[in-house]
Structure formats: structure tokens, C-alpha cells
């Protein structure tokens, strides 16, 4: 056969499925690859072809369309199991082809199991909700195009193994869960069951997301430097190991990048000649606020180092801070013999 | 339990503060709590809630934004300031919460409010 | 904003007979409809939440049904203690007003 673009197996689009539920799964040739759609390609003559790969197994073989009820089926750019079966699970391949174009992916489908209350190997997306912060939603995901719009489906919620019914700060109102305030307790999984029918036959469309409790912008406030400050003195010998923490404090905010660094006399430690080291560590609270420490660290100090700057800087999305350590040579206390032989007029 | 006080006779263009007392619980734990009035041979009228014990998130009825402030100010006691007071306002007014996550479960046995000159 | 109109007012129906209230919400509430009872001189009792779900210690023989915008409260066995006002209330967070209480429906004992 002629040469055909392949785009190999694409492992970013690991696709997870309950089983026993329906499936709809498009091709992602026109999603990720190809700069046109299927309607496009459809009228320029070309073919959408599907096959698979079965789990620990080489064999490439051709998608069964003629099972029972329909089981598995294509549409358009879309390939259907209505529903799916465990021994689904395998690398599935669309083909896009004619006479002179060909152009095909590979990607893998995992059909997973889930227990009664709803947990499974399944990845879940994480919705972070802010703390104390007004009616907030989150929304059953994933369920477009399952049945048309003339279709009203029953949507249940689950927090972890339990429905949510009279949760007095969570509202279910059909594909969204409103929740009028958010506290720490509402962390945890939620679930919906959207049941719809279709043929005379009843299926089941199971969707689990985590969601997250963090700091609401509302606290939100710029990064607080709560090392180095004005009542500790770094006061060294040369010589000696010269360590300062930087500790910063960061309120949540999403999407923001925070950032810590120092300053040696105004130039960042990489770009001088000092042998200077620094180690960060992250901690953070229940809410996701961010503590940073970043430790500088100069083994044997010098008596020009102990006469240096050190600023430590710190920026999120809500402003930027410096706060400079106060470094400074420890007199070397009186050698008591020769301060008294001084004293007695001795050379 | 649940009670309210405060209520009192009122001239029109007066404000007056309603307290609820809870006694029993704390709204540590971010109780839901309302206040819902009732003029005399009349049916419910919702005014606010509030998540008392969290940092103050209420809600608020669009005809009672402004005039009406809902506000915590203990970790047992919700206060109703009231504005602006006119005759439409004479009303029993109930404090009511949740218990169990079942809006409205905990009433308290109301104050009555006279607006009048 | 939300409205909640009930009908009919008053209702009434004999010891031993079944009295059915309606409830209608303006907007599509789901099943978030609470039933309440309330006797003169008393504070309101609640009497089912989540639409059909029955409050503790409620007598069996109140019973709610519907979800969407069509709500009904059924009262069968009917007792005189039953003579009471009966109030739906409504819950939707994406109105102004989050919560809406019906008119009220008398229901009178014969």
C-alpha cells in the first residue's frame, strides 16, 4: 500500500471509560493533526477508517460495526460504544484515506471498573472551588453530545459513596452542583450519574471530578517576606558558614506564578564569583496559600561578604516585595591576656 | 433552640436591630441562618441569610438589599438591621436555621415589629 | 427573581380524605422545593425538603412529589390536627433571590 502520514500512537490522549457505559470517541486526527475538519475532508472524497489493537497484542484488526444492538458504531468522526465492554480496552487507530492521501493516529483506550461508590483508576480533573466566597458551580462534565436536546436526563450527585441531598450548603440543580459556600469540608470527590434513554434501552453516564477548597482572591494579599526581618542580625566571623532564609508567604491566586529569589549587591548569586548555594522547599496549607523558604548558604564566608547586600525578593500575580538581611562581622571578643599585659605597660 | 428579640413599636423612618440567639449550638461550624417575616394574616416573605460563623457570606432578597443588613456578631447570636421602616414593614419577624443540612428546620417563635405613628 | 405561586386556597376536605396542594416554581428548580406547615400563633414547621424526601418525625401521610417547576403536596388520612396554613418554598441559585416562598394554601378540616 502507499506511503501514509502516521502520527504514531499518541499517548496524550490517554482516553478512560466506565464500563458498562456509553462512549463517544472522536477521532483526533481533525482535533490535534490536520488543519481541516471531517465535514471537509467527507466532501473531498475522502474515508474515515477505524481499527484496533487489543490489549497485549500485536494483531492490527478491523473495528466489529455488525454487533448485536449496535454496540459499536461510527458516525461522522465519532466512534460509539453503546455501551463498553472491559475487553474493549486497546490502542484504536482512524484513518483518514483515499486514492492519494492517507493520514492516520493511533491512541489508547482504557476501559475501566468502578466500585459501588464510584472509585476507580479513573484520572480525575480537580475543580477548585475558593473558600467563603458566594454561590460557586461546578458542572458535569464530558456529557455533550450523548443525547440531543430533547432528551431530559435525570442527574444525580454524590459526594464520595453518598447523595447529596440535604447538604445544607450544596444545591444540586440538574448538570451543575451549586454550592452556596465553599468550606474545607466540601473537599473530596463528586459525582454524577446522568441517566438518559435511548432505543427503548436506559444507559448511564458516570463522571467524577475532585474538587479543591482554596484561598478566595478576597484574602488575597501581595507576598509577605517574614524572613529576613529587622530583629534577626546575621553576624558571622570569616570563615565561618553564612546562612540566611528567605520565607515568603503567598495567599492563593489562581494561575499566578510565584517566584523567590536573591539579590547579592544587586546582581543575581549566578551572575558573581561568590560560592553561594541555595536551596528551596515548598510547604502549603489546606487552602493551597504557598510558603517558600530558600536558604542562601556560603560555606567560609570572607570579611568582603560580611559587607555585602543580600536583598531577598519575592512577586505573585498580587505585587512584589524585597527585604534585605541584616549581615554583619562579629568583633572578636578581648584576648584577655594580652588586653592585661597592654594594661600593665608591657611590651 | 432558636429565639429572636428586638422587636418593638416603631415610627415610620425609624431603623430597629433584630438579635436570634441560638442556644444549644454555635455557628462555628458555618450555620446557615435566615430571617423570613410575616405580616399579620399574610403568608412568608423571605429577607437574608447568612453563613454565620464563615466570613459573612449572605444572601439577600432583591427588595431587601439596602435597607435590610444581615451580619453575625457572636458565635450565637445573627442581628437584622432595618432601615428606613415604613407600615409595610409591621410584620412578625422569625429567625430560622438549618440543622442536618435541612433549610429552614429551626424556627424560632418570632418578634413582632409595629411601624406606626 | 424567582415566584412560587400555589394553589388552590383555601382547600378543605373531610376527616379521613386526601387533600392534594400545588406548588409551581417560574423557574426550572430541579427537585430544591421544601413543604412547610404552620398553625396560627406558631412558627412554621417543615414538613419535606428535597421535593418528596419526609423530615424527621413527620407523619407518613404527607407525601410531596414533581421536580422541574410542578410541585404537589398530598395529605391522605386527613386529620383535624392537620387544619393548618401550607407553604412551598424554593431554592435557585441563579436567581436574585434565592429563595422564594409560595402564598400559602389554607386547608380546613370538615
Known amino acids: 500500500s502507499e506511503r501514509c502520514d502516521d502520527w504514531g500512537l499518541d499517548t496524550m490522549r490517554q482516553i478512560q471509560v466506565f464500563e458498562d457505559e456509553p462512549a463517544r470517541i472522536k477521532c483526533p486526527l481533525f482535533e490535534h493533526f490536520l488543519k481541516f475538519n471531517y465535514s471537509t475532508a467527507h466532501s473531498a472524497g475522502l474515508t474515515l477508517i477505524w481499527y484496533w489493537t487489543r490489549q497485549d497484542r500485536d494483531l492490527e484488526e478491523p473495528i466489529n460495526f455488525r454487533l448485536p444492538e449496535n454496540r459499536i458504531s461510527k458516525e461522522k468522526d465519532v466512534l460509539w460504544f453503546r455501551p463498553t465492554l472491559l475487553n474493549d480496552t486497546g490502542n484504536y487507530t482512524c484513518m483518514l484515506r483515499n486514492t492519494t492521501y492517507c493520514s492516520k493516529v493511533a491512541f489508547p483506550l482504557e476501559v475501566v471498573q468502578k466500585d459501588s461508590c464510584f472509585n476507580s483508576p479513573m484520572k480525575l480533573p480537580v475543580h477548585k472551588l475558593y473558600i467563603e466566597y458566594g454561590i460557586q458551580r461546578i458542572t458535569c462534565p464530558n456529557v455533550d453530545g450523548y443525547f440531543p436536546s430533547s432528551v431530559k436526563p435525570t442527574i444525580t450527585w454524590y459526594m464520595g459513596c453518598y447523595k447529596i441531598q440535604n447538604f445544607n450548603n450544596v444545591i444540586p440543580e440538574g448538570m451543575n452542583l451549586s454550592f452556596l459556600i465553599a468550606l474545607i469540608s466540601n473537599n473530596g470527590n463528586y459525582t454524577c450519574v446522568v441517566t438518559y434513554p435511548e432505543n427503548g434501552r436506559t444507559f448511564h453516564l458516570t463522571r467524577t471530578l475532585t474538587v479543591k477548597v482554596v484561598g478566595s482572591p478576597k484574602n488575597a494579599v501581595p507576598p509577605v517576606i517574614h524572613s529576613p526581618n529587622d530583629h534577626v542580625v546575621y553576624e558571622k566571623e570569616p570563615g565561618e558558614e553564612l546562612l540566611i532564609p528567605c520565607t515568603v508567604y503567598f495567599s492563593f491566586l489562581m494561575d499566578s506564578r510565584n517566584e523567590v529569589w536573591w539579590t547579592i549587591d544587586g546582581k543575581k548569586p549566578d551572575d558573581i564569583t561568590i560560592d553561594v548555594t541555595i536551596n528551596e522547599s515548598i510547604s502549603h496549607s489546606r487552602t493551597e496559600d504557598e510558603t517558600r523558604t530558600q536558604i542562601l548558604s556560603i560555606k567560609k564566608v570572607t570579611s568582603e561578604d560580611l559587607k555585602r547586600s543580600y536583598v531577598c525578593h519575592a512577586r505573585s500575580a498580587k505585587g512584589e516585595v524585597a527585604k534585605a538581611a541584616k549581615v554583619k562581622q562579629k568583633v572578636p571578643a578581648p584576648r584577655y591576656t594580652v588586653e592585661l599585659a597592654c594594661g600593665f605597660g608591657a611590651t | 433552640s432558636l429565639e429572636e428579640s428586638g422587636g418593638d413599636l416603631v415610627k415610620p423612618g425609624a431603623s430597629l436591630t433584630l438579635t436570634c440567639t441560638a442556644s444549644?449550638?454555635?455557628?462555628?461550624?458555618?450555620?446557615?441562618m435566615c430571617w423570613v417575616r410575616q405580616a399579620p394574616g399574610k403568608g412568608l416573605e423571605w429577607i437574608a441569610c447568612i453563613y454565620a460563623g464563615s466570613s459573612g457570606v449572605t444572601y439577600y432578597a432583591s427588595w431587601a438589599k439596602g435597607r435590610f443588613t444581615i451580619s453575625d456578631t457572636s458565635s450565637t447570636t445573627v442581628t437584622l438591621q432595618m432601615t428606613s421602616l415604613t407600615a409595610a414593614d409591621t410584620a412578625t419577624y422569625f429567625c430560622?436555621?438549618?440543622?442536618?443540612?435541612?433549610?429552614?428546620?429551626?424556627w424560632g417563635p418570632g418578634t413582632l415589629v409595629t411601624v406606626s405613628s | 427573581a424567582l415566584v412560587m405561586t400555589q394553589t388552590p386556597s383555601p382547600v378543605s376536605a373531610a376527616v379521613g380524605g386526601t387533600v392534594t396542594i400545588n406548588c409551581q416554581a417560574s423557574?426550572?428548580?430541579?427537585?430544591?422545593l421544601a413543604w412547610f406547615q404552620q398553625k396560627p400563633g406558631q412558627p412554621p414547621k417543615l414538613l419535606i425538603y428535597r421535593a418528596s424526601t419526609l423530615a424527621s418525625g413527620v407523619p407518613s401521610r404527607f407525601s410531596g412529589s414533581g421536580s422541574g417547576t410542578e410541585f404537589t403536596l398530598t395529605i391522605s388520612g386527613l386529620q383535624s390536627d392537620d387544619a393548618a396554613t401550607y407553604y412551598c418554598?424554593?431554592?435557585?441559585?441563579?436567581?436574585?433571590?434565592?429563595?422564594?416562598f409560595g402564598g400559602g394554601t389554607e386547608v380546613v378540616v370538615k
Open positions: 423557574e426550572d428548580i430541579y427537585s430544591n
Open positions: 418554598l424554593g431554592v435557585y441559585t441563579y436567581s436574585t433571590d434565592i429563595h422564594a
Open positions: 444549644g449550638f454555635s455557628f462555628s461550624s458555618s450555620y446557615y
Open positions: 430560622a436555621s438549618e440543622t442536618d443540612g435541612n433549610y429552614f428546620n429551626l
